[in-house]
């Protein structure tokens, strides 16, 4: 079954996918598509790399990591409910039927509606980066301490969001990183 990732409407969603190049710069083609992985390449392609560079992409879809080091995780900008569904990351390892295929399920939740008392900043406005699922823990923890206008409910909500974002590491931990060569 697919690994599940979550984001809220208006956030940037992060779908992790990694491989280890045989040597630095020795890249393999990778594609991302909407829908489960079909028989060849990707269906409904949203982004594609070749042995050198990103050679096809559509608006709102980009690689935020260093794809030259094998981080081909997909970022989807400003998601809507229509972005929900299965995404295919396909690492096209040379050889006869050597491709590695990953189906990742993206669940988009409606944006949280947080009451905004006079002194409290709107949670989304105060933490735009923390509400993305592509964040990196330490920066978020530091930011948390620098903005005192948050109540305990909001801290709890933030913790849940950070937990969701750390699902990104689950793919690595579950052995889904592919070593080439």
């Amino acid at each position: 079954s697919e690994v599940e990732y979550r984001a809220e409407v208006g956030q940037n969603a992060y779908l992790p996918c990694f491989y280890t190049p045989a040597a630095p710069g020795n890249l393999v083609p990778v594609c991302w598509g909407k829908g489960a992985c079909p028989v060849f390449e990707c269906g409904n392609v949203v982004l594609r790399t070749d042995e050198r560079d990103v050679n096809y992409w559509t608006s709102r879809y980009w690689l935020n990591g260093d794809f030259r080091k094998g981080d081909v995780s997909l970022t989807i900008e400003n998601v809507t409910l229509a972005d929900s569904g299965i995404y295919c990351c396909r690492i096209q390892i040379p050889g006869i039927m050597n491709d590695e295929k990953f189906n990742l399920k993206l669940v988009i939740k409606p944006a949280k509606v947080t009451p905004a008392p006079t002194r409290q900043r709107d949670f989304t406005a105060a933490f735009p980066r923390m509400l993305t699922t592509r964040g990196h823990g330490p920066a978020e923890t530091q930011t948390l301490g620098s903005l005192p206008d948050i109540n305990l409910t909001q801290i709890s909500t933030l913790a849940n969001e950070l937990r969701d974002s750390r699902l990104a590491n689950d793919l690595r931990d579950s052995g889904a990183t592919i070593r080439i060569g």
Epitope: P29, G33, G35, A36, C37, P38, V39, F40, E41, C42, G43, N44, D50, E51, I86, Q92, I93, P94, G95, I96, M97, N98, D99
Partner: antibody, heavy 118, light 107 residues
């Protein structure tokens, strides 16, 4: 005009070999997965083989595995199918096709007839 | 291998009729299904991909629907030029397989 043109078909004896070629025009084959599909006389369609953009990944139907080899020369914008150890059941019209959307075939050649008979 | 079963094998209808062909996969293929039209002596032509997407240049009277294992192809108003054999094809995994075809004739 975007098109595919097959050549190389003909009559061959069982156990013989043939090499089919497919010349593409109006688009670059290097931007597409390519494939071969065949149709025996009066029968339905059967997928034969497919190849990735640069030729590093190849896929075959069980019925031809070990006998047929798909290849491409992107500099010549051409796809090939080397057919060895031919059997009478390989008799068919062979179509060169362009793959889209992960596995559907959006562009077909006219086909070339291969007849395996003694 | 995934077996694609088309029905009916032959279909007779009048010009202007609504025509429906079904295709059933022996296991789930998500939406990875295409429909082709083949006229006698000609190469097949892609009409529908991903179960319901209309290929560029194909008349809107052709449509497709379904997902998982059950799929439907419809011609909303049969025209004389639609006389052909229609094939479904899955592309969920290897090997790719086609249905046996449905021959559409005019009454």
């Amino acid at each position: 005009e975007v098109q595919l043109l097959e050549s190389g078909g003909g009559l061959v004896q069982p156990g013989g070999s043939l090499r089919l070629s497919c010349a593409a025009s109006g688009f670059t084959v290097s931007s597409n997965y390519m494939s071969w599909v065949r149709q025996a006389p009066g029968k339905g369609l059967e997928w034969v083989a497919a190849i990735s953009f640069d030729g590093s990944n190849k896929y075959y139907a069980n019925s031809v595995k070990g006998r047929f080899t798909i290849s491409r020369d992107n500099s010549k914008n051409t796809l090939y199918l080397q057919m060895n150890s031919l059997k009478t059941e390989d008799t068919a019209v062979y179509y060169c096709v362009r793959v889209r959307d992960g596995g559907s075939f959006d562009l077909w050649g006219r086909g070339t007839l291969v007849t395996v008979s003694s | 291998d995934i077996v694609m079963t088309q029905s009916p094998s032959t279909l007779s209808a009048s010009v202007g009729d609504r025509v429906t062909i079904t295709c059933r996969a022996s296991e789930s293929i998500s939406s990875w299904l295409a429909w082709y039209q083949q006229k006698p002596g000609k190469a097949p032509k892609l009409l529908i991909y991903t179960a319901s997407s209309l290929q560029s240049g194909v008349p809107s009277r052709f449509s497709g629907s379904g997902s998982g294992t059950d799929f439907t192809f419809t011609i909303s108003s049969l025209q004389p030029e639609d006389i052909a054999t229609y094939y479904c094809q899955h592309y969920a995994n290897l090997p790719l397989t086609f249905g046996q075809g449905t021959k559409v004739e005019i009454k």
